[in-house]
Amino acid sequence: FGISGKHFITVTTFTSAGNIGEDGTLSCTFEPDIKLNGIVIQWLKEGIKGLVHEFKEGKDDLSQQHEMFRGRTAVFADQVVVGNASLRLKNVQLTDAGTYTCYIHTSKGKGNANLEYKTGAFSMPEINVDYNASSESLRCEAPRWFPQPTVAWASQVDQGANFSEVSNTSFELNSENVTMKVVSVLYNVTINNTYSCMIENDIAKATGDIKVTDSEVKRRSQLELLNSG
């Protein structure tokens, strides 16, 4: 594998997702090199002239950085020596989505890997019992999603049942005119049953569970990013 006396080194990236309006991380690792001053990290984005970020000789070099990323990027400097070239991206926006390349050059050799960065919005759902309805119903709300997700209900007792006829889902555009609030109401629920509200788009899947008994209401929520790794 020798090229000019240098070898290829293994660089590994993970498809990752950024939640717009938050800081995000583009993950990249490489074979560690104890000589920090000999490590060069370059992040590039397909279709963008100039660099996303450059770190060399133990410090940032932003002289070639593209305007779009000015003031927004950082590597985890203290972790570079152990092979972490991940990039922190401040205030992720939809336009940050795309194909990125993590390029590494060390005293051991050089290598690169591409990363597909997806951007959107995803949030935890909250389920509450809606006592105002004529019959007992459940209201599942999640404040921020993009692209528009699908919403499905499930129940522990009636496994495999289709609840689309007894539920109503609406999407309300948020003030920044990108993300949307998701509201889904499930009607005619029965006591002593566990219901799940599942919200999913191509970036994330979130599930909210609620168990309603005569004496108490128990809730649980979880969120997972899709296509990571």
């Epitope: 939640n19 717009i20 309006g21 938050e22 800081d23 970020h53 410090k59 940032d60 932003l62 990323f69 000015r70 003031g71 927004r72 990027t73 950082a74 590597v75 400097a77 203290d78 922190r88 401040k90 205030n91 919005a121 949030s123 404040p143 921020r144 948020n174 003030s175 920044e176």
Partner: antibody
């Protein structure tokens, strides 16, 4: 014109509560990281709280559990709810926008005095 | 927690002179996340430099920023009377999310 205008400061007794407001014009609050920064008399700047574009919040340890940052998107306004106020919370409170490259827009500040 | 230490605490210079203000971080700070502010008495701070070396909108070119890692510098090439103020460096990204230096007072000699 991009502008931030704070209000709601005043004299309050220790243990009391106060809500500061920051009205924004010329830009959309929910698209930026919005902050509260304070400055005690004769002292330097101290970061207090942030609300991200996503709506998630974070605060300095000194105010955690006592101060809550929030926003009303329909009013394009930022708030700081301050509870269990202490003498050391006496300061000028500024709201400031972080437009990805530093706190580029600041309000004129509102003074909070905690004293019995 | 990253601590930013500014030096000197007070700098006494005359108009026309060159001012060099230092900001040292207790651990490495990304150049992208380092900013400088100017504050005059009774006024809100004003952003001067972001990304360690980029001038904010409307800032005269006599102001320049440099440095990386743990050592950053704000330079005012030729002092004007309106430049006498307090200057703060600030970093973003660790806990607490925003940290300011204690400030350097630039006063007329």
């Amino acid at each position: 014109e991009v502008q931030l205008v704070e209000s709601g400061g005043g004299l309050i007794q220790p243990g009391g509560s106060l809500r500061l407001s920051c009205a924004a014009s010329g830009f959309i609050v929910s698209r930026n990281y919005m902050n509260w920064v304070r400055q005690a008399p004769g002292k330097g700047l101290e970061w207090v709280s942030v609300i991200y574009g996503s709506g998630r919040t974070d605060s300095a340890d000194s105010v955690k559990g006592r101060f809550t940052i929030s926003r009303d998107n329909s009013k394009n306004t930022l708030y700081l709810q301050m509870n269990s106020l202490r003498a050391e919370d006496t300061a000028v409170y500024y709201c400031a926008r972080d437009a990805d490259y530093g706190l580029d827009v600041w309000g004129q500040g509102t003074t909070v005095t905690v004293s019995s | 927690e990253i601590v930013l230490t500014q030096s000197p605490g007070t700098l006494s210079l005359s108009p026309g002179e060159r001012a060099t203000l230092s900001c040292r971080a207790s651990q490495s700070v990304s150049s992208s996340y380092l900013a400088w502010y100017q504050q005059k008495p009774g006024q809100a701070p004003r952003l001067l430099i972001y990304g360690a070396s980029s001038r904010a909108t409307g800032i005269p070119d006599r102001f320049s920023g440099s440095g990386s890692g743990t050592d950053f510098t704000l330079t005012i090439s030729r002092l004007e009377p309106e430049d006498f103020a307090v200057y703060y460096c600030q970093q973003y990204g660790s806990s607490p999310l925003y940290t300011f230096g204690q400030g350097t007072k630039l006063e007329i000699k």
